[in-house]
């Protein structure tokens, strides 16, 4: 019998390399059985996760899973950082793993760091 708990499918230590100025959608895949839970996004500031109140979000429904999407239109340099989605379900708060966005500032194409270079930045290691 399949569990009817809400599950948030963000992989542990997931990372995305994105360009400032581009649009980007950060997805929180949500599995639920009956009623869709209330889901929010927050951004980590040290050990505190600050709720993102005034940001554009939307739902995308698929057959077996739904996606709660945080929209970046466009991505800004200060969007760099770690994010987490949370769901309220039967008075329980379920938190996802955090996912990290590495924002590359817009430069000429020849100066843009590759994904591999992004992964080498020591200040991004942890």
């Amino acid at each position: 019998k399949e569990s009817c708990d809400v599950q948030l499918y963000i992989k542990r230590q997931s990372e995305h390399s994105i360009l400032a100025g581009d649009p980007f959608e950060l997805e929180c895949p949500v599995k639920y059985c009956a009623n869709r839970p209330h889901v929010t996004w927050c951004k980590l500031n040290g050990t505190t996760c600050v709720k993102l109140e005034d940001r554009q979000t939307s739902w995308k429904e698929e057959k077996n899973i739904s996606f709660f999407i945080l929209h970046f239109e466009p991505v800004l340099p200060n969007d760099n950082g770690s994010y987490r989605c949370s769901a309220n379900f039967q008075s329980n708060l379920i938190e996802s793993h955090s996912t990290t966005l590495y924002v590359t500032d817009v430069k000429s194409a020849s100066e843009r760091p590759s994904k591999d270079e992004m992964a080498s930045r020591p200040w991004l290691l942890y």
Partner: antibody
Amino acid sequence: QVQLVQSGAEVKKPGSSVKVSCKASGVNIKDTYMYWVRQAPGQGLEWIGRIDPANGYARYAQKFQGRATITADESTSTAYMELSSLRSEDTAVYYCAVYDGYYESFDVWGQGTLVTVSS
Amino acid sequence: DIVMTQSPDSLAVSLGERATINCKSSQSLLDSDGKTYLNWLQQKPGQSPKRLIYLVSKLDSGVPDRFSGSGSGTDFTLTISSVQAEDLAVYYCWQGTLFPRTFGQGTKLEIK
């Protein structure tokens, strides 16, 4: 069950490159991380790096940064590790492995690929 | 990088006896999610490594219950309660908390 099959042994000249493949079955690789570890003859294990097949983001140990390139092809459930500027010290068995990205509930290793670097 | 140090480097145990392998990390492996990502691998001669234990003490499916893991923070232990002939192998601890992932140097288990 989850299985990994790696490409066959390679003999390479110093200064050249090698590309090892690793094909997964029994799992949707989007839900995993795939990583590479090497083992020199009679030595211990050394982590090279890992990739998130869902978005292609790869991360490397500092020692291999700029020399190793890990990629993944979701359509064929295959990960690749290319190592350039080979030297004799790169002679080793190269293992790929895959683990569950959400709960780490499984971690499966390939059979290994022996890469010999010799002039 | 986190340094993982195992002791002893090798261990000779009689069949049916208990074997204990220690692993020490240079910093805490407790992650921000409250979990500790410490794994134990077994590598039998001529074979690929195989994960035995994850999250300090959880046994992988199919692993005999004579294997157990314990510890917290920086100090961890793999115990084989009653060594069998098929346990002849090198055992590695490794951490999955921070990048880069790092391994202990390995402990060779021999049968007396």
